[in-house]
């Protein structure tokens, strides 16, 4: 056969679907690899061919589109399962070709089982809700294209294992779930089960997402440097270890990059000819506010090092702040035999 542009196995698209539920999978060629869509390809005389490799097998096989009740079918650039079975798991390939052109890509499809509380190995999308905010909504994801707009499905929402009915702060509104108030107690998994009829059969779509309640943008502040501060003086003798922590609190901000760094005499530590190490630790509050600590360490400090300026800097989407540490050379305590004796005029 003639050469085919093989995009390999697209592991970026780790498609997971539930057993015994409908699944519609678009050929990734048109979404990620080619600059034209299926309609253009079809009108240019290109044909889309599907085949697969079963789990733990090397043999590529054609997909059987002659199963009872059209359990597996193809419609334009979509491969349909009505419904899936556990042994549909494998690598699927879609190939676009005619006599002069060929392009193909493979992707893994995993059919997973769920228990009665919707627990499964499925990787769940995370939806962040703000604490101390107005009404917020989550929407039942990835249900477009399964049924026409003329079909009115029934949607049932669950919080973990509990059917959401007459909840004090959460109201199901069709495909949306409205949170009148988002409490930290609302953290967890929410599932919508969409039930719809098709050709005399009833299908269920189960979609679970994780809700994480985070700090409100209304309460967000620029970074706050807790240490160094004006109350602590780092007084050292030459030869001792100098340890200065820079501890910074960052309000949660969606998609904000939080940064902490030290400068020594206005330069980055790497650009100063001293043996300095910096260790960072990060902790998060229940609402994903962040505390970063960077400890600047000089194992054996010199009198020159004790004259330098050590400044902690922090930056987030809310602003940039800096604070200098107060570093001093410790005045050695006088030794009686020499210093005091001299002071008393002894010779």
């Amino acid at each position: 056969s003639e050469r085919c542009d093989d995009w390999g196995l697209d592991t970026m698209r780790q498609i997971q679907v539930f057993e015994d539920e409908p699944a519609r999978i678009k050929c990734p060629l048109f979404e990620h690899f080619l600059k034209f869509n299926y309609s253009t390809a079809h009108s240019a005389g290109l044909t889309l061919i599907w085949y697969w490799t079963r789990q733990d097998r090397d043999l590529e096989e054609p997909i059987n589109f002659r199963l009872p009740e059209n359990r597996i079918s193809k419609e334009k650039d979509v491969l349909w399962f009505r419904p899936t079975l556990l042994n549909d798991t494998g690598n699927y390939t879609c190939m676009l070709r005619n006599t002069t052109y060929c392009s193909k890509v493979a992707f893994p499809l995993e059919v997973v089982q769920k228990d009665s509380c919707f627990n499964s190995p499925m990787k769940l999308p995370v939806h962040k809700l703000y604490i101390e905010y107005g009404i917020q909504r989550i929407t039942c994801p990835n249900v477009d294209g399964y049924f026409p707009s003329s079909v009115k499905p029934t949607i049932t929402w669950y919080m973990g294992c509990y059917k959401i009915q007459n909840f004090n702060n959460v109201i199901p509104e069709g495909m949306n779930l409205s949170f009148l108030i988002a409490f930290i107690s609302n953290n967890g998994n929410y599932t919508c089960v969409v039930t719809y009829p098709e050709n005399g059969r009833t299908f269920h779509l189960t979609r679970t997402l994780t809700v994480k309640v985070v700090g409100s943008p209304k309460n967000a502040v620029p970074p706050v440097i807790h240490s160094p501060n004006d109350h602590v003086v780092y007084e050292k003798e030459p030869g001792e270890e100098l340890l200065i922590p820079c501890t910074v609190y960052f309000s949660f901000l969606m998609d904000s990059r939080n940064e902490v760094w030290w400068t020594i005499d206005g330069k980055k530590p790497d650009d100063i000819p001293i043996d300095v190490t910096i260790n960072e630790s990060i902790s998060h509050s229940r609402t994903e506010d962040e505390t970063r600590t960077q400890i600047l360490s000089i194992k054996k400090v010199t009198s020159e090092d004790l004259k330098r300026s050590y400044v902690c800097h922090a930056r987030s989407a809310k602003g940039e702040v800096a604070k200098a540490a107060t570093v001093k050379q410790k005045v050695p305590a006088p030794r009686y035999t020499v210093e005091l004796a001299c002071g008393f005029g002894a010779t």
Partner: antibody, heavy 119, light 107 residues
Framework: EVQLVESGGGLVQPGGSLRLSCAAS????????VHWVRQAPGKGLVWVSR????????QYAESVKGRFTISRDNAKNTLYLQMNSLRAEDTAVYYC????????????WGQGTLVTVSS | DIQMTQSPSTLSASVGDRVTITCRAS??????LAWYQQKPGKAPKLLIY???SLESGVPSRFSGSGSGTEFTLTISSLQPEDFATYYC?????????FGQGTKVEIK
Amino acid sequence: EVQLVESGGGLVQPGGSLRLSCAASGGTIGGSAVHWVRQAPGKGLVWVSRILTYSSTTQYAESVKGRFTISRDNAKNTLYLQMNSLRAEDTAVYYCARGSSEYPKFDIWGQGTLVTVSS
Amino acid sequence: DIQMTQSPSTLSASVGDRVTITCRASQSISSWLAWYQQKPGKAPKLLIYDASSLESGVPSRFSGSGSGTEFTLTISSLQPEDFATYYCHQLLIYPHTFGQGTKVEIK
């Protein structure tokens, strides 16, 4: 520390009206909601109504729906419960309580105001 | 409405005793339960929220446990100031409902 102080209670005839106030001192009420809870003499606690802080959404117990109205005046940092068509069974100490914004809990309570409905 | 049933209704105990109060919900409320203490003529005071979290400033002799429909409030060593009435409160389902109360009195 925010404190809640109720006022407006008293003796009223059946069918009459009263307006209870719940004023916050020491800061804004804050929280996720403010609730009214009542306690008939010698009885337990019964939830009456709530108003959400961020959306002004209101909810009522079935026993008071259509008769009681909860509202607030942000400028005065005060919550109100307008009680109409009062009945003998509405006799109780009325407490306002703040619903926390972090967890479902009523973390601050007022000292209560007594409403007596009697002819 | 969800029924919250507390037991016992009255409990006689002595200072130093370990006291346990049970609260049962008529349907599952996850961990959306709070416990309050009320003394005569006073407003209720929050002790426990989220079924097992101790409210700030509340002595550590108070603890809560449970999830779903069965919950307990435990006072590990009863103190003179603990003689009061205790209420459980479910906050998951509309409307909020309270237990009928458990009066802890001196034996």
